[in-house]
């Protein structure tokens, strides 16, 4: 017999999101505009195309990538699909809010857009470590917390440091990650007697989850070059990245085979490991001066991925109650974290190539911003979770965990679908 | 050459509209992003709006944001200022100006104006 | 950042070496360029990056400095120098100049 949603989430989900939806459309209503300067129609469509492959990555991307769950594949495609449009649409306002609101309006541009469509994927990297034990009710707090906090991160970040767009939504990798660990570290850990073959992955759903890495593999260099000012900056991006994931997927797909007794290749380290190199050249990728280097920094990443991938699951698994194959919430901290030692590292090299004296101060500047963004993350991660164990939002039971007729209508209700 | 020419001054009463263009000669507009900087009779120079290179992005300064609109045309090599509700002190030749960008140590990226127009006379007097 | 220049105004010959200092409200790393503006006309850029001489500006004009103490060297007075120059920063993108340094003939 089918699983239905619990009776009082069948009246709160609808009228939750569906009020608050209302108020989205009556603050846009009241307080935005379109950019009415638009004169050069080409240059309209090549600046929608940045954020037509920053959509690509969230929806199919990071929609595809965590549906590998043998009992919650549809649940995670259209669950990401949902946060993401809720997402954009408050990570817009907000980011309207506190950077222009106090000249009237908050005016709408493609580019207001394209922050939007970042931050968002934001709640995407996070949702990893809980999807599968959360409702959309749940999901839909997890967003607004979420894109709050990181708007509010890159605000601060933006006037204590002076970062541009570029650095302060780099940030993203270690806040996203960080954010989503504490998160689940709140929820509820231990999966019951019987519920362990639904967090398994299987294959036709390892298949989806596999074009959800390679679409994010395909569209990286535009998420990390979206923000720059600059074409040369931007070409510059671009090549770094792309290196960066193209060794990458070799060192995931060779260092797999290599960490398995038998030499086989594990599903789940190549899911996440292909996207390494992309994740660690993602801070200062407009800086590195040339191809080797994006190239050994991928094949670092991707080291590190494997490696994480392998001793990291266990740990996550006891602590925090993630299942061995959402493994990218542990991965993008550490890759994150590599992402902005490396940052460092190149600021300390120029630095130093200056002769000018000011490495100690930018180095403190940079673990400043490094710091604060953890420090956000998990305590807005922590807050997050503490709402989500509210008895409000009748959470799914343990025994219904990682399992999609929870949520869906299946007309065949097919036990192992 | 390259080279970056304004028009579009004049002489405005307070509350009024003009409408300030920049054509770029000697380079493609579309591989920069561009800024315009006022000064004041006697005073010095003071940076207005910048927009980037493919015009997805823009700023102003505290004192026009709400009232200017920088914008441009990449496929007419123009960038364009529009000034709203004009006001006394917006008296000034206007400039515009190239934001170069360029690699330095210890920097990462930095702009600087590396090619400017000769100015146009913008007057708001009743 | 606010970019406080000194002096606001100088007299010098020909031949003299003369400096030129800006002060940022907060560090500003290296991001910083000079530009040199002759009556009547549009700025140049001399120096960028605190340091750098642009193409085609003469040696004479040396930058120096970063975090927030900057000068301006001109170390041997040409009739041609005598102009108001301009100290500008790029650390944040609200652009900001210093007040100018008008060098007169003495």
């Known amino acids: 017999m089918s699983s239905k949603y619990p009776r009082s989430v069948r009246r709160c989900l609808p009228l939750w999101a569906l009020t608050l939806e209302a108020a989205l459309i009556l603050l846009f209503y009241f307080f935005t505009h379109y950019d009415a300067s638009l004169e050069d129609q080409k240059g309209l469509v090549a600046s929608y195309q940045v954020g037509q492959d920053l959509t690509v990555m969230a929806a199919i991307g990071l929609g595809f990538l965590t549906s590998s769950f043998r009992r919650h594949s549809w649940s995670s495609v259209a669950f990401n699909l949902f946060m993401l449009a809720l997402g954009v649409q408050w990570a817009i306002l907000l980011d309207g809010f506190l950077s222009q609101f106090p000249s009237g309006k908050v005016v709408i541009t493609l580019f207001s857009i394209r922050l939007a469509t970042m931050s968002a994927l934001s709640v995407l990297i996070s949702v990893d470590a809980v999807l599968g034990k959360v409702n959309l009710a749940q999901l839909v707090v997890m967003v607004l917390v979420e894109v709050t906090a990181l708007g509010n991160l890159r605000m601060v970040i933006s006037n204590i440091f002076n970062t541009d767009y570029h650095m302060n939504m780099m940030h993203i990798y270690v806040f996203a990650a960080y954010f989503g660990l504490s998160v689940a570290w709140c929820l509820p850990k231990p999966l019951p007697e019987g519920t362990e073959d639904k967090d398994q992955t299987a294959t036709i759903p390892s298949l989806s989850a596999m074009l959800g890495a390679l679409f994010l593999w395909m569209f990286w260099p535009s998420f990390n070059s979206a923000l720059l000012r600059s074409p040369i900056e931007r070409k510059n991006a671009v090549f770094n990245t792309y290196y960066a994931v193209a060794v990458s997927v070799v060192t995931a797909i060779s260092g797999s085979s290599l960490a398995h007794p038998q030499g086989k290749i594990s599903k789940t380290y190549v899911h996440s490991a292909v996207l390494a190199g992309g994740v660690a050249v993602g801070t200062s990728c407009h800086l590195i001066p040339s191809p080797w280097l994006a190239m050994v920094l991928g094949l670092v990443a991707g080291l590190i991925s494997v490696g994480g991938a392998k001793y990291l699951p266990g740990c996550c698994n006891r602590v925090l109650g993630i299942p061995h194959s959402s493994i990218m919430g542990y991965n993008f901290s550490l890759l994150g974290l590599l992402g902005e030692i490396i940052y460092i590292v190149l600021l300390v090299l120029d630095t130093v190539g200056a002769g000018n004296g000011m490495i100690g101060f930018q180095v403190l500047l940079s673990i400043g911003e490094l710091s604060l963004a953890i420090v956000i993350a998990l305590m807005s991660g922590l807050l997050t979770g503490l709402l989500l164990n509210l008895k409000i939002w009748k959470a799914p039971h343990e025994a219904k965990y990682f399992d999609d007729q929870v949520f869906w209508k299946f007309p065949h209700l097919a036990v192992g679908f | 050459e390259v080279q970056l020419l304004e028009s579009g001054g004049g002489v405005a009463q307070p509350g009024r509209s003009l409408r300030l263009s920049c054509v770029a000669s000697g380079f493609s507009l579309r591989s920069y992003g561009m800024h315009w900087v006022r000064q004041a009779p006697g005073k010095g120079l003071e940076w207005v709006a910048d927009i980037w290179f493919d015009g997805s992005n823009k700023d102003y300064a505290d004192s026009v944001k709400g009232r200017f609109t920088i914008s441009r045309d990449n496929s007419k090599n123009t960038l364009y200022l529009q000034m709203n509700s004009l006001r006394a002190e917006d008296t000034a030749v206007y400039y515009c100006?190239?934001?170069?960008?360029?690699?330095?140590?210890?920097?990462?990226?930095?702009?600087?104006?590396?090619?400017w127009g000769q100015g146009t006379m913008v007057t708001v007097s009743s | 950042a606010e970019l406080t220049q000194s002096p606001s105004s100088l007299s010098a010959s020909v031949g003299d070496r003369v400096t030129i200092t800006c002060r940022a409200s907060q560090s500003i790393s290296t991001y910083l360029n000079w530009y040199q503006q002759r009556p009547g006309k549009a700025p140049n850029l001399l120096i960028y990056a605190a340091s750098t001489l642009q193409r085609g500006v003469p040696s004479r004009f040396t930058g120096s400095g970063s975090g927030t103490d900057f000068t301006l060297t001109i170390s041997s007075l040409q009739p041609e120098d005598f102009a108001t120059y301009y100290c500008?920063?790029?650390?944040?993108?609200?652009?900001?100049f210093g007040q100018g340094t008008k060098m007169e003939i003495r």
């Open positions: 500008q920063q790029s650390y944040t993108t609200l652009w900001t």
């Open positions: 100006a190239r934001d170069w960008r360029v690699r330095a140590f210890s920097s990462g990226w930095l702009s600087a104006f590396d090619i």
